[in-house]
């Protein structure tokens, strides 16, 4: 008989190399039977995982599995780091393995404006 426990299928030590300035979707594959659990994302800061409150998320439903998606529109240099999804199911908290984003800042050093230019570039 198949288990009806909620399972989060993020592989151990999974990682993504992504570019700042472009969009990215971080997926948390969720397996459940009847009621879809409440799933959240958090970002690791040392030993604590800080819940991501103001971020855009969505569900993508497929036949045998669902995906809880964290949207980056776009990716920022500050998004570099490790993330974890967790599900509340029947008063139990199930946590995924962490997945790490390696963000490359595509604005090269030569194109990077100086502090003065950074201030002035906000004028049309």
């Amino acid at each position: 008989k198949e288990s009806c426990d909620v399972q989060l299928y993020i592989k151990r030590q999974s990682e993504h190399s992504i570019l700042a300035g472009d969009p990215f979707e971080l997926e948390c594959p969720v397996k459940y039977c009847a009621n879809r659990p409440h799933v959240t994302w958090c970002k690791l800061n040392g030993t604590t995982c800080v819940k991501l409150e103001d971020r855009q998320t969505s569900w993508k439903e497929e036949k045998n599995i669902s995906f809880f998606i964290l949207h980056f529109e776009p990716v920022l240099p500050n998004d570099n780091g490790s993330y974890r999804c967790s599900a509340n199911f029947q008063r139990n908290l199930i946590e995924s393995h962490s997945t790490t984003l390696y963000v490359t800042d595509v604005k090269s050093a030569s194109e990077r404006p100086s502090k003065d230019e950074m201030a002035s570039r906000f004028w049309a």
Epitope: L19, P23, N78, M118, R121
Partner: antibody, heavy 120, light 106 residues
């Protein structure tokens, strides 16, 4: 010097389509996103969508089914196409550069806008 | 979608007066941008990421807030500040603007 310039038809008949070209200079479309924003007296400022540096697009879900954004990196041009125009699509259409800093994203440089009137 | 409500819609202030306008979001946002627009011109970035002044913006302007409540303040109103100010959120698609606060000089 960063510049964006929109060119459009000015007048469009109801139910027809709208095509606007945004020609940019002073930056590369492979590094920066370009957004389309419109401003109408009735609706104020409305974000329509963006062409991201890598070629993906994101749209406002409301007018999304009528919208298409594309680009030609080599010509430094971004294109907005909107189908089935109605009178409430009458607005000033702006193309706007988007840029990121360490922990936020903002639209920094705006074109001068192109006025579009939908009327028969 | 996140609705941004700006108040007041129209604000009249005398030179030297302190001015505060607010922007309330229907859901929590990470930060707020503000744009200034004068008739016949494109919007200009004025305050970005809640509290950072764009280049050339006088130090009498400031921005603050968090969550669902944000504000733009002018410590001493000047004639050149007369314009419409829009708040703008970049937390959730569709990325919305407020309806604007039109600031007039008395």
């Amino acid at each position: 010097q960063v510049q964006l310039k929109e060119s459009g038809p000015g007048l469009v008949a109801p139910s027809q389509s709208l095509s606007i070209t945004c020609t940019v200079s002073g930056f590369s479309l492979t590094t920066y996103g370009v957004h389309w924003v419109r401003q109408s007296p009735g609706k104020g400022l409305e974000w329509l969508g963006v062409m991201w540096p890598g070629g993906r697009t994101s749209y406002n879900p409301a007018p999304m089914s009528r919208l298409s954004i594309s680009k030609d990196n080599s010509k430094s041009q971004v294109f907005l196409k909107m189908n089935s125009l109605q009178t409430d699509d009458t607005a000033m259409y702006y193309c706007v550069r988007g840029d990121y800093e360490y922990d936020y994203y903002a639209m920094d440089y705006w074109g001068q806008g192109t006025s579009v009137t939908v009327s028969s | 979608q996140i609705v941004l409500s700006q108040s007041p819609a129209i604000l009249s202030a005398s030179p030297g007066e302190k001015v505060t306008m607010t922007c309330r979001a229907s859901s929590s946002v990470s930060y707020m941008h503000w744009y200034q627009q004068k008739p016949g011109s494109s919007p200009k970035p004025w305050i970005y990421a809640t509290s950072n002044l764009a280049s050339g913006v006088p130090a009498r302007f400031s921005g603050s807030g968090s969550g669902t409540s944000y504000s733009l303040t002018i410590s001493r109103m000047e004639a050149e500040d007369a314009a419409t100010y829009y708040c703008h959120q970049w937390s959730s698609n569709p990325y919305t603007f407020g309806g604007g606060t039109k600031l007039e000089i008395k």
